[in-house]
Interface confidence: medium
């Protein structure tokens, strides 16, 4: 069974998938469609790197531009370095500016909904 066929079998169970499962899927050439990606738990998507999302979505990564204002894509963008987002070649904006440090202050983030940044 190839990655695409495997994905079809597990698609209906993915809504509640944890980050670890999504990271594992990104290594299996599954080409997750955007409709499924948009239904994933935001907290599971946020830790994914740009490279992992690109591998997870395959050709569908090109559709992220259309979803950049919607969750979980919007929140995921806010967590990525702008330099990394730029490598996708999709014109996604809103990432962490180059030179900023991201502090993983869970309480701060829980209150504000955004990561705490320290300027250069």
């Amino acid at each position: 069974m190839n990655g695409s066929e495997y994905f079809v079998k597990i698609q209906s169970f993915l809504g509640g998938a944890p980050t670890e499962d999504l990271k594992a899927l990104s290594q299996q050439n599954v080409s997750m469609d955007l409709a499924t990606f948009m239904k994933l738990r935001t907290d599971a998507v946020l830790p994914l790197t740009v490279a992992e999302v690109q591998k997870l979505l395959g050709p569908h990564v090109e559709g992220l531009k259309a979803e950049e204002r919607h969750r979980p894509v919007r929140d995921w963008i806010l967590r990525q370095r702008q330099d990394d987002l730029d490598t996708l070649g999709l014109g996604l904006q809103g990432g962490i500016p180059n030179g900023y440090l991201v502090l993983d202050l869970s309480m701060q983030e829980a209150l504000s909904g955004t990561p705490c940044l320290l300027g250069p």
Partner: antibody, heavy 120, light 107 residues
Framework: EVQLVQSGAEVKKPGASVKVSCKAS????????MHWVRQAPGQRLEWMGN????????NYNEKFKNRVTITVDKSASTAYMELSSLRSEDTAVYYC?????????????WGQGTLVTVSS | DIVMTQTPLSLSVTPGQPASISCKAS??????IAWYLQKPGQSPQALIY???YRYSGVPDRFSGSGSGTDFTLKISRVEAEDVGVYYC?????????FGGGTKVEIK
């Protein structure tokens, strides 16, 4: 208005290489991936690969993987497709087409096509 | 690779009559399908995306349906300008693949 202007027709000998250009205008070149599709006489359309204009990263159809190279010149908003070790079966019209422009998947815009004839 | 199989190979239609083209994918592609029309001597032009959505400027006599592996393009009333070769294409996974085409002619 989106425009894709390709280089002119080419006649090549078997074993040679050809490099076709595609100059894009009317949209942000680095925000949409550029794809190349070819059509041999009387044959179906055949996807060759694509390029991320921001990073230069590419995906290729395995059928062409060792012979095709897709590149970009960001400053000139131009994509290139080079095919090496040409054989008679490579005689075809080659098209460039960006994907997902205007947030809609599919190839909504195509270049005018470049006829490459391989003949001894 | 996902193989896209179109039927029929050709279609001869009286103006004003309907036409229907089928496209079958060798594996599930969801609704990640587009349809194109290639008129003689021209580049392909996009008609339908996501299986059933018309691109702007495409007449409403064109409609698409289907999901999974079976898809259909319908022309409610064929006009002279609709002649050409129609292609389906999947963009569900790499490599992107096209159907073999259906040639539509006017009787």
């Amino acid at each position: 208005e989106v425009q894709l202007v390709q280089s002119g027709a080419e006649v090549k000998k078997p074993g040679a290489s050809v490099k076709v250009s595609c100059k894009a205008s009317g949209y942000t070149f680095t925000s949409y991936w550029m794809h190349w599709v070819r059509q041999a006489p009387g044959q179906r359309l055949e996807w060759m690969g694509n390029v991320n204009p921001s990073s230069g990263g590419s995906n290729y159809n395995e059928k062409f993987k060792n012979r095709v190279t897709i590149t970009v010149d960001k400053s000139a908003s131009t994509a290139y497709m080079e095919l090496s070790s040409l054989r008679s079966e490579d005689t075809a019209v080659y098209y460039c087409a960006p994907h997902y422009i205007g947030s809609r998947p599919g190839f909504a815009y195509w270049g005018q096509g470049t006829l490459v004839t391989v003949s001894s | 690779d996902i193989v896209m199989t179109q039927t029929p190979l050709s279609l001869s239609v009286t103006p004003g009559q309907p036409a229907s083209i089928s496209c079958k994918a060798s594996q599930n592609v969801g609704t990640n399908i587009a349809w194109y029309l290639q008129k003689p001597g021209q580049s392909p032009q996009a008609l339908i995306y996501s299986a059933s959505y018309r691109y702007s400027g495409v007449p409403d006599r064109f409609s698409g349906s289907g999901s999974g592996t079976d898809f259909t393009l319908k022309i409610s009333r064929v006009e002279a300008e609709d002649v050409g070769v129609y292609y389906c294409q999947q963009y569900n996974s790499y490599p992107l693949t096209f159907g073999g085409g259906t040639k539509v002619e006017i009787k």
